[in-house]
Amino acid sequence: GLQDPCSNCPAGTFCDNNRNQICSPCPPNSFSSAGGQRTCDICRQCKGVFRTRKECSSTSNAECDCTPGFHCLGAGCSMCEQDCKQGQELTKKGCKDCCFGTFNDQKRGICRPWTNCSLDGKSVLVNGTKERDVVCGPSPADLSPGASSVTPPAPAREPGHSPQDIEGR
């Protein structure tokens, strides 16, 4: 079949195959990231809690990140979520201290339970805090020569609530 004449239009232009001269430059604050596009897309604006990480151009969209005190969530930083302190988690009512027996060593995410050392037949070497997991001590079996003395913490479980987010495009 015949080649689509619009395929000759480069990124940064749009194509109208109803016209003889088919390629036109994208207007200011719009872009086309591939050739042969029928329209240019409006540039993303990084406003409010969003901050411009990369300016828009005629061939690529702007990229946003979050202002200090917030962090990105979602593909392409589609949301900004409030940071909390270590030892806290974000709830619908804001940042709340981790309950006893849980910890969070980051500014984001949820409080996770301390590792249960006794499940592995180990003792608690260092007590847990709101900011740090417990450190498990050696079990009798570990006391044999050449054995490791510290067990790493259990892997984090997946977040169990929907974040309080601030959306924007």
Partner: antibody, heavy 114, light 107 residues
């Protein structure tokens, strides 16, 4: 801050050649198509040429086709206009501009006269 | 090529007045029209794009309207620094073309 700085203009005899340069800074040059636009003394604006961001697509005004060649070096953030077989009617201030035509350089004057 | 015709060629007025500049395209250019301001010895400055969108940093007294073939640039209350030449231009198709300009001069 976006900046476009043209250079290379001057006085040249009819039939002669000149090469104009446009140095870009303050934006991602390789992501923008670029234009040359000229303005004869006391006259209006006339579009001259366009080159796409990667250099694969080029357009010229009929008045310069076959005589002028537009090119770019993205590694040097530079745009060029090679002007051959110059005529008196090519006398103008030559501006480079981004393809959004939002930022222009200050221009460089080309005078074609014997 | 698409011909852009501006009128009037010259406009004499006083600061504080409202002014409307006209630009007509020889064929339909949708809304792909920009307006530029140029002062002596300076490069053109983009004021309006897409017929009605004010560019970053352009004062609110400047506004654009129109689509198809008829376009206008309005300055709601002319300031002393607005006396300059104004050009319309179309980016609907190559070659890009500009109007001949309207000179705003002090009465």
């Amino acid at each position: 801050e976006v900046q476009l700085v043209e250079s290379g203009g001057g006085l040249v005899q009819p039939g002669g050649s000149l090469r104009l340069s446009c140095a870009a800074s303050g934006f991602t040059f390789s992501e923008f198509g670029m234009h040359w636009v000229r303005q004869a003394p006391g006259k209006g604006l006339e579009w001259v040429s366009y080159i796409s961001s990667g250099g694969s697509t080029i357009y010229y005004a009929d008045s310069v086709k076959g005589r002028f060649t537009i090119s770019r070096d993205n590694a040097k953030n530079s745009l060029y206009l090679q002007m051959n077989s110059l005529r008196a009617e090519d006398t103008a201030v030559y501006y480079c501009a981004r393809d959004w035509v939002d930022y222009w350089g200050q221009g460089t004057l080309v005078t074609v006269s014997s | 090529e698409i011909v852009m015709t501006q009128s009037p060629a010259t406009l004499s007025l006083s600061p504080g007045e409202r002014v409307t500049l006209s630009c007509k395209a020889s064929e339909n250019v949708g809304s792909y029209v920009s307006w530029y301001q140029q002062k002596p010895g300076q490069a053109p400055r983009l004021l309006i794009y897409g017929a009605s969108n004010r560019y970053t940093g352009v004062p609110a007294r400047f506004s654009g309207s129109g689509s198809g073939t008829d376009f206008t640039l309005t300055i709601s209350s002319v300031e002393p620094e607005d006396f300059a030449v104004y050009y319309c231009g179309q980016s609907y198709s190559y070659p890009l073309t500009f109007g001949g300009g309207t000179k705003l001069e002090l009465k």
